[in-house]
Interface confidence: medium
């Protein structure tokens, strides 16, 4: 028996369902009574789901997995993972045994989009050209870690005096805070771009300083 899986990682959004595809080519006369199917975590060998002795043995992984029972006889051994969490990320191995045995691993990459950045300015009043200001760009609840880029109103990258920090919350999602320290010109726009490298998703925030008032 030959097991086939996708070579590319499966990308799943947090809180959505994901399908880890795995297939085999059944011989003529194949019956499910002959099939032993095991899904496990590749690194830890922890059992995730199994089908043995002609029946679905169910989920051994937080009761969020399912097979496609009507498709098994056609060689579809795919696994459905429900309500994906950050902690589900990793490699899953599909083992199929009929008369002989084969296995293959498929990677699950979890992702979550970042929120539209909020911009704060310190100080936020009585601003004059030549003043040093601190602009903070904050974006929340994304995964994996973001990349943050700053640009001025002409689109020129601002790379000096930038400090970016990221912290995971209890769900494993990241909040990112990027601080730009800059000397004000007569007027100017400062924008930050928060990029999710998996989703190739960009979230933009900007602040325009034109004397008074400020525009966010």
């Amino acid at each position: 028996v030959e097991v086939q899986v996708s070579e590319d990682p499966v990308v799943a959004l947090v809180d959505t369902d994901a399908t880890l595809r795995c297939s085999f080519s059944p011989e003529p006369g194949f019956s499910l009574a002959q099939l032993n199917l095991i899904w496990q975590l590749t690194d830890t060998k922890q059992l995730v789901h199994s089908f043995t002795e002609g029946r679905d043995q169910g989920s051994a992984y937080s009761n969020r997995t399912a097979l496609f029972p009507d498709l098994l006889v056609q060689g579809n051994a795919s696994l459905r993972l429900q309500r994906v969490r950050v902690t589900d990320e990793g490699s899953y191995t599909c083992f199929v045994s009929i008369q002989d045995f084969d296995s293959a691993a498929v990677s699950l990459q979890v992702a979550a989009p970042y929120s539209k950045p909020s911009m704060t300015l310190e100080p936020n009043k009585d601003l004059r050209p030549g003043n040093m200001v601190t602009i903070t760009c904050s974006s929340y609840q994304g995964y994996p870690e973001a990349e943050v880029f700053w640009k001025d109103g002409q689109g020129v990258p601002l790379t000096g005096n930038v400090t970016t920090s990221q912290m995971a919350n209890e769900r494993g999602l990241f909040d990112v805070h990027s601080v730009l320290r800059v000397v004000l010109g007569a007027n100017g726009t400062y924008s930050c771009l928060v990029r999710n490298p998996v989703l190739q998703q960009d979230a933009h925030g900007s602040v325009t300083i034109t004397g008074q008032p400020l525009t966010f």
Epitope: Q166, G172, P197, V198
Partner: antibody
Framework: EVQLLESGGDLVQPGGSLRLSCAAS????????MSWVRQAPGKGLEWVSG?????????YYADSVKGRFTVSRDNSKNTLYLQMNSLRAEDTAVYYC??????????????WGQGTTVTVSS | EIVLTQSPATLSVSPGERATFSCRAS??????LAWYQQKPGQAPRLLIF???TRATDIPDRFSGSGSGTDFTLTISSLQSEDFAVYYC??????????FGGGTKVEIK
């Protein structure tokens, strides 16, 4: 075989400059975040700098080297660099490059080079 | 910056014995902790990630546990090749990535 190979370590005077290189092979270099980690003689490990993958890489630094060291990468050459300026005696260490365990993020480093020695002394 | 404190600094153990050492974080880091082994003159080697998952080809005598601020690395039965320095590293809040000061495991 997945491999990282550092080079460029040398004896340099305080205030001097040095450029370290880390040549990667056996994996898709452009998909992995990379780090430099150093170890002073008889001391523990200290993360120095890291670089991400998008747009040629966002750079991150430890406070102790910020403004003096610059990390960069050339994905076409599968090479990571560390430009070290205004070197101080306390920068004396073995410098390792490390590959992150998983693409797209900082996690833990599962592939390390053998290290290159930087000595700052007059 | 998250500070990781490892204890003890040195652990004297006989081959075949169990070794347990600790890593404490200055603030909660969930399960975002790794353990490395380093032998003299060698680069570090990843043992454990996500606090408890063994890296590829790491023997099952190595196990990690803990979450939040308190973590433990256990070697169930020390082999001669296990005498080394062990470091923990957090990746929950960065930059910087931070390492603990290390625990040296020496032969009793």
């Amino acid at each position: 075989e997945v491999q990282l190979l550092e080079s460029g370590g040398d004896l340099v005077q305080p205030g001097g400059s040095l450029r370290l290189s880390c040549a990667a092979s056996g994996f898709n270099f452009s998909s992995y975040w990379m780090s430099w980690v150093r170890q002073a003689p008889g001391k523990g490990l200290e993360w120095v700098s890291g670089i991400s993958i998008s747009y040629g890489g966002n750079a991150y630094y430890a406070d102790s080297v910020k403004g003096r060291f610059t990390v960069s990468r050339d994905n076409s050459k599968n090479t990571l660099y560390l430009q070290m300026n205004s070197l101080r005696a306390e920068d004396t260490a073995v410098y390792y490059c490390g590959r992150d365990r998983s693409p797209y993020q900082y996690r833990s480093m599962d592939v390390w080079g053998q290290g290159t020695t930087v000595t700052v002394s007059s | 910056e998250i500070v990781l404190t490892q204890s003890p600094a040195t652990l004297s153990v006989s081959p075949g014995e169990r070794a347990t050492f600790s890593c404490r974080a200055s603030q909660t880091i969930g399960n975002k902790l790794a353990w490395y082994q380093q032998k003299p003159g060698q680069a570090p080697r990843l043992l454990i990630f996500s606090a408890s998952t063994r890296a590829t080809d790491i023997p099952d005598r190595f196990s990690g546990s803990g979450s939040g601020t308190d973590f433990t690395l256990t070697i169930s039965s020390l082999q001669s090749e296990d005498f080394a320095v062990y470091y923990c590293q957090q990746y929950n809040n960065w930059p910087p990535l931070t390492f603990g000061g290390g625990t040296k495991v020496e032969i009793k």
